[in-house]
């Protein structure tokens, strides 16, 4: 696994411990919590990051209307079970044997049950809608400039292939970023939209996961973009399975 050889650190994940005892005596970085080796040349999976976090010493409407099946992460933090590749296991349980099924971003998509609950597969989240509200500015951002800056950010900082950022919508003061990625579209080395969205969310909150970097500093034509509020909707390839109709506002 790639890591900064000179001082054995992980540029893409500060929630790691690195030591020079990897294959070939190279630097190896392990995620806190799980101990799994991570590839420091790309983003770490959200599951491993959540596990590490839990273990750490914590006019014309242009905006998209979230689907009735869109999920919001209302459950907050939990200590997840990750598979050998660092992805969320389909079934998650807490210490009191309460279990539920999750999607590929680790958000609950069924009612909670007991240990007998079956989750046959990890249902893929193929569409993520990130809704931001920016601080008031003297004048609205130019939509085209904003679009370009956010696309550059996701490509350069999060290494997300440009084709997976499908649209940027803007209706002052609300910005919506749409990420779309089907399982068939995602190549072996492609960053998952779930991971890119999670890194972005942590950046926006001033909790950057990148080693030695301050929070996000996005500027549109020299004007800083200050985010006041974030809401993220997750749309799965299959509808969620809740017994009662739920409100999805977060």
């Amino acid at each position: 696994h790639t890591a900064a050889q000179d001082n054995c650190t992980c540029p893409t994940n500060k929630m790691t411990v690195c030591s020079p005892d990897g294959p070939g005596g190279r630097c190896q970085c392990r995620a806190l919590g799980s101990g799994m080796a991570v590839d420091c040349s790309t983003l770490t999976s959200k599951c491993l990051l959540l596990k590490a976090r839990m273990s750490a010493p914590k006019n014309a409407r242009t905006l998209v209307r979230p689907s009735e099946h869109a999920l919001v992460d209302n459950d907050g933090l939990y200590d997840p079970d990750c598979d050998p590749e660092g992805r969320f296991k389909a079934r998650q349980c807490n210490q009191t044997s309460v279990c539920w099924c999750v999607n590929s971003v680790g958000v609950r998509r069924t009612d909670k049950g007991d240990l007998s609950l079956r989750c046959d597969e990890v249902v893929r989240t193929h569409h993520i809608l990130i809704e931001l509200r920016h601080r008031p500015t003297d004048r609205a951002f130019n939509h085209s400039d904003l679009d370009s800056e956010l696309r550059r950010l996701f490509q350069e900082r999060y290494k997300l292939h440009p084709s997976f950022l499908s649209a940027v919508h803007y209706e002052e003061p609300t910005i919506q970023i749409e990420l779309r990625q089907n399982a068939s579209q995602k190549g072996l080395r492609d960053v998952d939209i779930a991971d890119a969205a999670y890194y972005f969310e942590r950046d926006i909150k001033g909790e950057s996961l990148f080693m030695g970097r301050r929070g996000l500093d996005v500027q549109v034509r020299g004007e800083p973009l200050h985010v006041e509020r974030t809401l993220i909707y997750y749309l799965d390839e299959k509808p969620p399975q809740f017994s009662m109709k739920r409100l999805t506002a977060g």
């Epitope: 054995c8 030591s19 020079p20 005892d21 799980s34 101990g35 799994m36 050998p84």
Partner: antibody
Framework: QVQLQQPGSELVRPGASVKLSCKAS????????MHWVKQRHGQGLEWIGN????????NYDEKFKSKGTLTVDTSSSTAYMHLSSLTSEDSAVYYC????????WGQGTTLTVSS | DILLTQSPAILSVSPGERVSFSCRAS??????IHWFQQRTNGSPRLLIK???ESISGIPSRFSGSGSGTDFTLSINSVESEDIADYYC?????????FGSGTKLEIK
Amino acid sequence: QVQLQQPGSELVRPGASVKLSCKASGYTFTSYWMHWVKQRHGQGLEWIGNIYPGGGYTNYDEKFKSKGTLTVDTSSSTAYMHLSSLTSEDSAVYYCTRSSVFDYWGQGTTLTVSS
Amino acid sequence: DILLTQSPAILSVSPGERVSFSCRASQNIGTSIHWFQQRTNGSPRLLIKYASESISGIPSRFSGSGSGTDFTLSINSVESEDIADYYCQQSNSWPFTFGSGTKLEIK
């Protein structure tokens, strides 16, 4: 050369506690994980847990979470394992070993819990 | 937790023979497996790391292979000093685990 030095033996009473030591030399102590391994007489090897001296991060096997506590003193390059509420089941050889590949081992401390 | 299953429990061979030890992991662990020799009353000694990487000071008759879930330690010409217990250990994720060991006996 890398060395991990452990006391040869410890004799303690049931119910008491003990603090086993492992003094490291010959490498940068804060750059490598230190692990502890238990071996009862005639039995196999069991991983107890590890500690990263550079940050104090610890991990334990579930079985040993209420039994052992790992600490380090970076000024003396020494790792410690505190074992509490000792019973005869805790009588064993305890090894400290370095890095994720366990490339260097101490000689082991034979802990005898007996009245 | 990752379970490592070693087989057989005991191997009995004649000097000069080739011998192979098996270690099977309960899930894919890539090449994060290491092999140890433990002679009577001694500390374990690292023989092979990351499935196939040789260790300085270890005789060249020891070699390792495998990836994923199935791993093998081989001694291409057994000597009497090789009488010992042999353990595999995974460092893929915490908690680290050991196999139950294989005892090598000389006929």
